[in-house]
Interface confidence: medium
């Protein structure tokens, strides 16, 4: 199709070679044709529409991304081209930042029901660069953790070095919402609650003498409890002692609750105690068998192919830990009669 | 007992000024509500004027009409909540309740005042 | 700012009668969304917060549905004490705060 008279749209993607981060291309069409399938509320009722209102389906997915390449080939589908790249709804979804990621990307309606409909579409001419040089030390992060029920805040990265007063007016999206009334390089949560959880985007204008660039970064936004101010306790096993059949294998499984830390390095391993002696044992990894905001339960087995005499001498003791503390607990093997 | 009261309604000319003050009692000020000013036009509806929260944030949130004309302000160490009217209209007459919304989930107004007549008029 | 529609502006019903109120949000607001009770003379009443929650101490004939844009207030069986005027509110504030609006109200009044 004949992308002349597609709307055009310039951004900029400065990305950090430090960390990960991801990046959204919007399907900005015009209004009114956008709210007939994306129901996305997001150019002010003062925005004229640029073309006639596009006459499309209500599928939230009913758009088609494309890219131009640069050679002049034929516009190609994103979906069949570009793993890296994703689309959700109305959104692309960048998954990893690279200037191979630079170019004009095309969002259409996939179904094309008036004559009017065929201008119904943007071209975005995406930059990508990284950051040259380190000028803002502390810029924010692509990755920011609210507290529950704390007040706290999300920064634009690319705007975090500015002061309020320096910074020109943002644009924020909350997972691909507009935010209307916020303004500022940084918004304000007086008290965060799960809902503030979500990927942020944050928009200004860039101009030169020749053009203007918008200017978009990415935030992806937790919502955490505090950090856990106890040791890790051990669920199982709760006995200290465990019977068992002589030559048949044995499963022991220790299962120990994790407090939430930011910095998350939890250790949990089992060990043998024989007499004086204690070795470490190479036993399956751990694995999380249940994750909630507050806490991990984290476990781990020792397996045994065949239970020995020497093994009813044996202690089998768990060791869990975290930043704060460890603890254990020993489990000895006894015969199991009749 | 839980209570707001509302006081400062007063006749005023039209371009005057009044300042609404709502003194609370029961609860504490620094705890983390939304205190907002809800106005409502004799025989019409409720209206939004304003809201602060009285978290560390102290954010402020206008209804767009007020923005300019009104200012929303609090004083934690009398527990005492503040609407500062300015350059008032004839529209402006109207009840002005105080109300404390929760500060989770979108804060609903579980307390309200019993209002404060404002009349503009020459 | 948000506007909230609500309908009917005022309704006529009988004790028993089963009651329903809309109210219409221009843009999302999720489930943040309240609905009071008003008496002549007396402040608002909450009975029901984040749109379907209803509030300790008001009668289980109150009940609310709805999210996003589209809400709804029920009275399964309307009582003597009923007849009031009903207003809907966005409740959203921080982040997702558009405007702590309210609808225009419905009046219930007795046929």
């Known amino acids: 199709f004949n992308i002349s008279g597609c709307s055009t749209k310039k951004l900029l993607w400065t990305y950090s070679t430090r960390s990960e981060e991801e990046f959204v291309l919007f399907c900005d069409l015009p209004e009114p044709q956008k709210s007939h399938f994306c129901h996305r509320n997001r150019l002010s009722p003062k925005q004229v529409p640029e073309h006639l209102p596009f006459m499309g389906s209500n599928d939230l997915s009913d758009v088609q991304w494309y890219q131009q390449p640069s050679n002049g080939d034929p516009l190609e589908d994103i979906r069949k081209s570009y793993p890296h790249i994703i689309q959700d709804k109305c959104t692309l979804h960048f998954l990893t930042p690279g200037v191979n990621n630079s170019g004009s990307y095309i969002c259409r309606p996939k179904m094309i029901k008036s004559p009017y409909d065929v201008a119904c579409c943007v071209k975005m001419i995406l930059e990508v660069k990284p950051q040259t040089n380190a000028s803002c030390e502390y810029s924010a992060s692509h990755k920011q953790d609210l507290l529950l029920g704390s007040t706290g805040s999300i920064s634009c990265p690319s705007l975090s070095c500015q002061s309020d007063a320096q910074s020109p007016a943002v644009t924020w999206y909350k997972n691909g919402k507009l935010l209307s009334v916020e303004r500022s390089n940084r918004i304000v949560v007086d008290e965060v609650y799960d809902y503030h959880q979500g990927t942020y985007v944050c928009d200004y204008t860039q101009s030169d003498t020749v053009s203007s660039w918008t200017v978009r970064a990415v935030v992806q936004v937790r919502t955490i409890v505090g950090d856990t101010k106890l040791k890790p306790d051990i669920l199982d096993p709760v006995e200290d002692t465990l019977e068992v059949e002589l030559g048949k294998p044995l499963t022991i499984s220790c299962k120990a609750r994790f407090g939430f830390e930011r910095v998350f390095n939890p250790v949990i391993k089992w060990y043998i105690k024989d007499s004086d002696l204690e070795w470490e044992v190479s036993v399956p990894e751990a694995k999380s068998i249940k994750s909630t905001l507050k806490d991990e339960i984290i476990e781990r087995n020792i397996i045994l192919e065949k239970v020995t005499q020497r093994d009813l001498r044996r202690k089998f003791v768990c060791f869990v830990q975290n930043s704060i503390g460890n603890t254990t607990q020993s489990v000895q093997l006894k015969e199991k009669r009749g | 007992e839980v209570q707001l009261e509302e006081s400062g309604g007063d006749l005023v000319q039209p371009g005057g000024s009044l300042r609404l003050s709502c003194a609370a009692s029961?609860?504490?000020?620094?705890?983390?509500?939304?205190m907002c000013w809800v106005r409502q036009a004799p025989g019409k509806g409720l209206e939004w004027v304003a809201c602060?929260?009285?978290?560390?944030?102290?954010?402020?949130y206008y209804a767009s009409w007020a923005k300019g004309r009104f200012t929303i302000s609090k004083d934690t160490s009398k527990n005492t909540l503040y609407l500062q009217m300015n350059s008032l209209r004839a529209e402006d007459t109207a009840v002005y309740f105080c109300?404390?919304?929760?500060?989770?989930?979108?804060?609903?107004?579980?307390?309200w005042g019993q209002g404060t007549l404002v009349t503009v008029s020459s | 700012d948000i506007q909230m529609t609500q309908s009917p502006s005022s309704l006529s019903a009988s004790v028993g009668d089963r009651v329903t109120i809309t109210c219409q949000a221009t843009?999302?607001?999720?489930?943040?969304l309240a609905w009071y009770q008003q008496k002549p003379g007396q402040a608002p009443k909450l009975l029901i917060y984040?749109?379907?929650t209803l509030e300790s101490g008001v009668p289980s004939r109150f009940s609310g549905s709805g999210s996003g844009t589209d809400f709804t207030l029920t009275i399964s069986s309307l009582q003597p004490e009923d007849f009031a005027t009903y207003y809907c509110?966005?409740?959203?504030?921080?982040?997702?705060?558009?405007?702590?609006?309210f609808g225009g109200g419905t009046k219930v009044v007795i046929k």
């Open positions: 984040r749109a379907s």
């Open positions: 029961g609860f504490d000020f620094s705890s983390n509500y939304y």
């Open positions: 843009e999302d607001i999720e489930s943040f």
């Open positions: 109300a404390r919304g929760a500060g989770s989930y979108g804060g609903a107004v579980r307390l």
């Open positions: 602060i929260y009285t978290g560390s944030s102290g954010s402020t």
């Open positions: 509110q966005c409740t959203v504030y921080g982040v997702n705060f558009v405007a702590n609006a």
